[in-house]
Amino acid sequence: IWSAVFLNSLFNQEVQIPLTESYCGPCPKNWICYKNNCYQFFDESKNWYESQASCMSQNASLLKVYSKEDQDLLKLVKSYHWMGLVHIPTNGSWQWEDGSILSPNLLTIIEMQKGDCALYASSFKGYIENCSTPNTYICMQRTV
Amino acid sequence: IWSAVFLNSLFNQEVQIPLTESYCGPCPKNWICYKNNCYQFFDESKNWYESQASCMSQNASLLKVYSKEDQDLLKLVKSYHWMGLVHIPTNGSWQWEDGSILSPNLLTIIEMQKGDCALYASSFKGYIENCSTPNTYICMQRTV
């Protein structure tokens, strides 16, 4: 978070920013930035595997829900979108693309279909769906 | 938009940012930043007048919809929220808080109730509502 004073080295201008204000990012151009995470909602419907690859090609991952507080903007998301949550049949757990296990009480998992992938829906719900079904998807990039 | 190189004058560190990435803002702390506009969704229900005052107290205004392209994140917003659109009975027009007239084809206006204020709903719909009815609201701050 960059606050108080910025020096734009390209133009050598001093820019005053109120201490209560800050810059967010960096994010890919035209992505949503919130609490220093970057999000993009993609309109085209793809299956989970193609959605995953699409996010990766943009140096991102499918949505990972890790905090209701830091990601409270997700409460208000309309419709269903692929996120990076997959079911591991061997141990029955749900895990994110980075291999971390879904924390309890973060998502309400709802069995909509038989499947090993999950769609994000508003108010922190995860709908189980067949990974081959086309859906819109949310990519996320965490800023350092 | 701050890209390529930033100088953080507080720590005098040079930070390399890919040219395809950029900072967004500045915005009030923990607001959503998108295409250099700042947005915040407020959970508490207030009537239109209180909502307007709340946004003003945060150096912002109620949501102004001015571009489907620049504000396409609004497509996916769930539920109904006060925006800064009011009906002017004298000439029958709808105008924003800044006095500008609602551009044609930006919003589909739907008469839900008799009233002179409007709620924003997903996919660029505006629902007419009595200004005294409590609702959640969206504040917006345009960055320079």
Epitope: N47, Y49, A53, G99 | -
Partner: antibody, heavy 121, light 107 residues
Framework: QVQLLESGPGLVKPAETLSLTCTVS??????????WDWIRQPPGKGLEWIGS???????YYDSSLKTRVTISVDTSKYQFSLRLSSVTAADTAVYYC?????????????WGQGTLVTVSS | EIVMTQSPDFQSVTPKEKVTITCRAS??????LHWYQQKPDQSPKLLIK???QSISGVPSRFSGSGFGTDFTLTINSLEAEDAAAYYC?????????FGPGTKVEIK
């Protein structure tokens, strides 16, 4: 059991285009979870990823080769192909085709036997 | 790009000895790390996926561990047929990258 077989010329002249084909047998090239890749290994060196393709035609390339590489798929022939233009001696390598079974982040679980391509005049 | 480093480059080991090969990523890759074995004049063969997941048909003496940036491949009781080069591979982000390899020789 899925098997992969690379084919194509073993010798390519500098500045020309290297063309290889991988034929998939014993399984479907259009399975929704499969991605198909090209990987190479210069003599006595390590492995280098070239790129991936999905049956829909979506491609993902190594940025250092992006301007020279094209990967395509022909689902009717159960084949995917690699074209690498403007080759130099540095492109001399054993070229492997491989598969990811469960999405692009999965491991390469099946490999072809590899084909040596030498770039020389 | 994510740079993968491996150590050691080379290891000469007696049969039945325990072998440990480490792989380090230049940034966190979660568990998106896979191990391959390559014998001379053969194509690589998958040993372990997602850092620690065993592969059907691979002897149980091969195991993997780690998360984030540091990973380990362990061969519990080396056999003569394990003489090969071992490579780690990250699939967390494009471009996919491999470690430089560790050559294991039988004494």
């Amino acid at each position: 059991q899925v098997q992969l077989l690379e084919s194509g010329p073993g010798l390519v002249k500098p500045a020309e285009t290297l063309s290889l084909t991988c034929t998939v047998s014993g399984g479907s090239i259009t399975s929704t979870s499969y991605f198909w890749d090209w990987i190479r290994q210069p003599p006595g060196k390590g492995l280098e990823w070239i790129g991936s393709i999905y049956h829909s035609g979506s491609t993902y390339y190594d940025s250092s080769l992006k301007t020279r590489v094209t990967i395509s798929v022909d689902t009717s022939k159960y084949q995917f192909s690699l074209r690498l233009s403007s080759v130099t001696a540095a492109d001399t390598a054993v070229y492997y085709c491989a598969r990811h079974e469960f999405g692009i982040r999965d491991a390469f679980d099946i490999w072809g036997q590899g084909t040596l391509v030498t770039v020389s005049s | 790009e994510i740079v993968m480093t491996q150590s050691p480059d080379f290891q000469s080991v007696t049969p039945k000895e325990k072998v440990t090969i480490t792989c380090r990523a230049s940034q966190s890759i979660g568990n998106n790390l896979h191990w391959y074995q390559q014998k001379p004049d053969q194509s690589p063969k998958l040993l372990i996926k997602y850092a620690s997941q065993s592969i059907s048909g691979v002897p149980s003496r091969f195991s993997g561990s780690g998360f984030g940036t540091d990973f380990t491949l362990t061969i519990n009781s080396l056999e003569a047929e394990d003489a090969a080069a071992y490579y780690c591979h990250q699939s967390n982000s494009f471009p996919f990258t491999f470690g430089p390899g560790t050559k294991v020789e039988i004494k």
